[in-house]
Structure formats: structure tokens, C-alpha cells
């Protein structure tokens, strides 16, 4: 990995042992101001592998609300507008970091947690297994 | 929002003011052990809206490596294997949380940051604007 010289103005770490505890400022800095304003919000409806969005809420997690994609069909929508089972709608998944309150119900103490979320769906050619 | 009774065993907060600073245990708990073992790793190649994955590395960020999807074509791959420009390949984007070292180069002090990442691509019907 890359070694970075330590800034002498860093706060002291209360806990030098692992599991490592760090200080995190929850005042979120949003880097998305310069992103393309063309939102992907309607892609779930216009895709050849359309999906529905389900709200997953957990007050012990930060962020407490995460939207999960569920593919609407097993197949994909073809040029005529029919569900075609020669192709498959599949979820595109991503591992994301969330903060889990630990101990539970504590407002100022968290543990980093990795969860797998389905972000949307894409249409793929199926893998065909030929039986000898 | 939902009000949760505070656990009396919570650690004290060093800073009661906003921007709120909290303690975070970086010993990641991975909730993905029970997820479907069928990985989406080859979907980028099998999709009708295929994408390439680009490595984005930033040692001042946690996680330091994030993979960004870039759609391979403007159109989508049709049944003949050709790029069809009557359809559009578009990136599926998601806002994710990362930790940014603040002050820079500090091992134990972070700020929460929201960034927009492209996770994969999907094939959509274009929006056609009819000129009167």
C-alpha cells in the first residue's frame, strides 16, 4: 500500500488496539454537486430489464433508508415489448459501507458494516449448460 | 423519525455540537455471508449494455479502491450481436458513503462523504422528443 506521512495536527487516537476505533465527523460532505444532472431515476421503468424499488428501513443503521432493486421479470423486454426468456434480467449488486449502532441504540457509537445491495438490473445472455 | 431509547451503556460523546463527531469501530462486520454465491462479476461482459470497470484509487479515502463502471457503447447489443442505436446503454448510479481522512493523512480521524458511483449499465428505450 501507499505510505502517507502522518499529519502532526492529527487528533490522538483513544484506542491503539484493534478493533480500531476512529473519530468520524457525520457532517456529510457531498461530492455529487458536479455530477451529470441527468438522473437515473426513471431507468428502472425504461430498461429492457426493468426493476421495482423496495424501501429497506433500519433505525439502527446509518443511512437508515436504503432502496433495494428487484428485477420485475425473469426475462428481458424484447423489441416487440414482450418478456423474452432467451435473455435474463439480473440484479447488479454492490457492496457498500454503512454504520451500525453499536452498542445498539447508541447515538454516538458505530461499527462499520459491509452490506450487499441490488442497485438495478441488466439484461444478460444466459449461460447455457449443454448436457452430454 | 423513529425515537429509540438510549442505551445507558453508550460511550460519552466528546462533542455534543454539530458537526457531530462519533466513534466508529473499523473492524468491519460483513453481512454478506448468506448472500447468493452466484456472483455478478461476469455480467459486465454478458450484458446487452456491457461495461468496463475502472479502478479509482485514493489513499485519503476509505475504502481506498472503488471500481467505476463505464458503458462500452452508446447503444445496446441486439440479438445479432450488433450495436443497436435505437436503444441506449446507460450507467446505473448509486450514492455511497465513504470515509475521507480529515485532517488529511490522519489515520484515526475521518469525515463522512457521499459520492456517486456507476455500478453497471442497463439498456433503456430512449426518450424521443417530437418537434412540432
Amino acid at each position: 500500500g501507499i505510505t502517507i506521512p502522518r499529519n502532526p495536527g492529527c487528533p490522538n487516537s483513544e484506542d491503539k488496539n484493534f478493533p480500531r476505533t476512529v473519530m468520524v465527523n457525520l457532517n456529510i460532505h457531498n461530492r455529487n454537486t458536479n455530477t451529470n444532472p441527468k438522473r437515473s431515476s426513471d431507468y428502472y421503468n425504461r430498461s429492457t430489464s426493468p426493476w421495482n424499488l423496495h424501501r429497506n428501513e433500519d433505525p439502527e443503521r446509518y443511512p437508515s433508508v436504503i432502496w433495494e432493486a428487484k428485477c420485475r421479470h425473469l426475462g428481458c423486454i424484447n423489441a416487440d415489448g414482450n418478456v423474452d426468456y432467451h435473455m435474463n434480467s439480473v440484479p447488479i449488486q454492490q457492496e457498500i459501507l454503512v454504520l451500525r449502532r453499536e452498542p445498539p441504540h447508541c447515538p454516538n457509537s458505530f461499527r462499520l458494516e459491509k452490506i450487499l445491495v441490488s442497485v438495478g438490473c441488466t439484461c444478460v445472455t444466459p449461460i447455457v449448460h449443454h448436457v452430454a | 423519525g423513529i425515537t429509540i431509547p438510549r442505551n445507558p451503556g453508550c460511550p460519552n460523546s466528546e462533542d455534543k455540537n454539530f458537526p457531530r463527531t462519533v466513534m466508529v469501530n473499523l473492524n468491519i462486520h460483513n453481512r454478506n455471508t448468506n448472500t447468493n454465491p452466484k456472483r455478478s462479476s461476469d455480467y459486465y461482459n454478458r450484458s446487452t449494455s456491457p461495461w468496463n470497470l475502472h479502478r479509482n484509487e485514493d489513499p485519503e479515502r476509505y475504502p481506498s479502491v472503488i471500481w467505476e463502471a463505464k458503458c462500452r457503447h452508446l447503444g445496446c447489443i441486439n440479438a445479432d450481436g450488433n450495436v443497436d442505436y435505437h436503444m441506449n446503454s446507460v450507467p446505473i448510479q448509486q450514492e455511497i458513503l465513504v470515509l475521507r481522512r480529515e485532517p488529511p493523512h490522519c489515520p484515526n480521524s475521518f469525515r463522512l462523504e457521499k459520492i456517486l458511483v456507476s455500478v453497471g449499465c442497463t439498456c433503456v428505450t430512449p426518450i424521443v422528443h417530437h418537434v412540432a
Epitope: 429492457t48 421479470h73 425473469l74 423489441a79 416487440d80 415489448g81 414482450n82 | -
Partner: nanobody
Framework: EVQLVESGGGLVQPGGSLRLSCAAS????????MNWYRQAPGNERELVAR???????NYGDSVKDRFTISRDNAKNTAYLQMNSLKPEDTAVYYC????????WGQGTQVTVSS
């Protein structure tokens, strides 16, 4: 929630007309073919009429020249205009988006009787 809701069914005399509507919610119909099926008691479900995403229509042999399928993507609704109705058109009529693997409505009863 993704759903299709049919309306416009009812009791009509032979030779009469009805217009069925199929309103979609939770999704847009523009990417789908829109289809009307029917099922009479003791019979298999049969395709009555279909309109593709591009607007091409086709009809079951028994309803050709009497029924007309149409769609209004802006209203997110499909229609079935039924003229010169016969007693054998009596059935539950189902709206569908995307054909067999797609989205189905609950159905509306059409009864042709004097």
C-alpha cells in the same frame, strides 16, 4: 406497486358494444406490448388482441373486424373497443403487459346476453 386494473365490463345485448380500459400504475406501459386475453368458463385462456410496443396490432380469428385494440402511452392506459358483440364473447377479459411472463390484471367480466 406494479399493477394493471381493467374496467368497462358488464352486461350487454347481442350486437352491442363495450369499451374496456386497462390502467397501469407503478410502471410505464410504453416499453411493453399490451395484450387482451379472455377466459370463458371451462375454456383455456385465449389471446384476443395484441398491440406491440411499436403499435403493430394483431387479433384472434374470432374477433377480427369486430374488436380494436389501442394504447395511450401518455395516459398509461390500453383499450379494447368491442363492437357487434356475440354471446360467445362472454368471458372474463384480462389485460396484460409483456405477454406470458409479464404483468396481469385481475380481469373484468363481459356478459353478452339478451
Amino acid at each position: 406497486e406494479v399493477q394493471l386494473v381493467e374496467s368497462g365490463g358488464g352486461l350487454v345485448q347481442p350486437g352491442g358494444s363495450l369499451r374496456l380500459s386497462c390502467a397501469a400504475s407503478g410502471f410505464i406501459i410504453s416499453i411493453y406490448s399490451m395484450n387482451w386475453y379472455r377466459q370463458a368458463p371451462g375454456n383455456e385462456r385465449e389471446l384476443v388482441a395484441r398491440i406491440t410496443r411499436g403499435g403493430t396490432t394483431n387479433y384472434g380469428d374470432s374477433v377480427k373486424d369486430r374488436f380494436t385494440i389501442s394504447r395511450d402511452n401518455a395516459k398509461n392506459t390500453a383499450y379494447l373497443q368491442m363492437n357487434s358483440l356475440k354471446p360467445e364473447d362472454t368471458a372474463v377479459y384480462y389485460c396484460n403487459a409483456g405477454a406470458d411472463g409479464g404483468i396481469w390484471g385481475q380481469g373484468t367480466q363481459v356478459t353478452v346476453s339478451s
